[in-house]
């Protein structure tokens, strides 16, 4: 999906009002310096691409974050504020339902959510000091 035409300001507002708090809740008890940055993004559409990938794609050691509160709110925000996003996610959602497993918070998942926090921070501060 091409995130170029999303309403970035509305997504930013959704992040600031709820998603950020849910990410903090998930990471509670973890030091903010515990994980180094291993993923970055270079503009707002790129950030959303990487956020979607880390939030909804299973990875080794972290089978699924998609049922977490922050993930469901992320999905809702993208569905509302990115034209045509919902349609691209129907097949992915059906596959995810079949894979549903019991929820276990592994260290790998904590690391992944730490990277998500970094990506969201970058999404929300697009204007570096203009040089």
């Amino acid at each position: 999906y091409d995130f170029t035409n999303c309403d970035f300001e509305k997504i930013k507002a959704a992040y600031l009002s709820t998603i950020s708090k849910d990410l903090i809740t998930y990471m509670s008890g973890t030091k903010s310096t515990e994980f180094n940055n291993t993923v970055s993004c270079s503009n707002r559409p790129h950030c959303l691409t990487e956020i979607q990938s880390l939030t909804f794609n299973p990875t080794a050691g972290c089978a699924s974050l998609a049922k977490e509160m922050f993930a469901m709110k992320t999905k809702a925000a993208l569905a509302i504020w990115c034209p045509g996003y919902s349609e691209t996610q129907i097949n992915a959602t059906q596959a995810m339902k079949k894979r549903r497993k019991r929820k276990v918070t592994t260290n790998k998942c904590l690391e992944q959510v730490s990277q998500l926090q970094g990506l969201w921070r970058r999404f929300n501060r697009p204007l570096l000091k203009q040089q």
Epitope: T38, S40, S42, N43, H46, R122, P126, K129, Q131
Partner: antibody, heavy 122, light 108 residues
């Protein structure tokens, strides 16, 4: 463990070519801008080139423009520097480094390789 | 193109504060990064975006930037701080990375 490992350095005659490589591991390579920086013996750091995270855009120092080419293969997590028409003044340790970027602005170089020595001599 | 000027050397007594400057035209409008390099080793980022510090760098390292001068401050200097220090900016008008000439810090 995030790591950059350079290879390909060696002794080469003036006018000849050399290809340096940098293998990245421990991070999502395709999301970072990547640089080559060099350091002549006893001298300071000199920036050589940068390539965008996507590989679509490159920038070069005037001293190497037209002679050096920076490329990347995001599927293999590798960065390359093709050096042609080498001169004695290209003798240096060559480092690769990663850099987050925002739009067309490159940020700090937070991870560096250990460097590979290139000696241009007849 | 853009030029960054650093003093070639700075000395500090153990336990005292060292300040290394980096001069450039209106450098306060740019994000300045600082690197430490010990002999035979690769550079290490110690301060980025003027004053932020990577998690692995001690709080003794700090930075500031305004007007035509950026400053790296190393408080409570230690023998292990002896190194070359380089400032760096991204010159977005010419699309270049620019390094200062480097400053050799000696802990007396």
């Amino acid at each position: 463990q995030m790591q950059l490992v350079e290879s390909g350095g060696g002794v080469v005659q003036p006018g000849r070519s050399l290809r340096l490589s940098c293998a990245a591991s421990g991070f999502t390579f395709r999301t970072y801008g990547m640089h080559w920086v060099r350091q002549a013996p006893g001298k300071g750091l000199e920036w050589v080139a940068v390539i965008w995270y996507s590989g679509t855009t490159t920038h070069y120092a005037d001293s190497v423009k037209g002679r050096f080419t920076i490329t990347r293969d995001n599927s293999k997590n590798t960065l390359n520097l093709q050096m042609n028409s080498l001169r004695a003044e290209d003798t240096a340790v060559y480092y690769c480094s990663r850099s987050p970027q925002w739009e067309d602005i490159f940020e700090s170089m937070d991870i560096w390789g250990q460097g590979t020595m290139v000696t241009v001599s007849s | 193109s853009y030029v960054l000027t650093q003093p070639p050397s700075v000395s500090v007594a153990p336990g005292q504060t060292a300040r290394i400057t980096c001069g450039g035209n209106n450098i306060g409008s740019k994000n300045v990064h600082w690197y430490q390099q010990k002999p035979g080793q690769a550079p290490v980022l110690v301060v980025y975006d003027d004053s932020d510090r990577p998690s692995w760098i001690p709080e003794r390292f700090s930075g500031s930037n305004s007007g035509n001068t950026a400053t790296l401050t190393i408080s409570r200097g230690e023998a292990g701080d002896e190194a070359d220090y380089y400032c760096q900016v991204w010159d977005s008008s010419d699309f270049l990375v620019v390094f200062g000439g480097g400053t050799k810090l000696t802990v007396l």
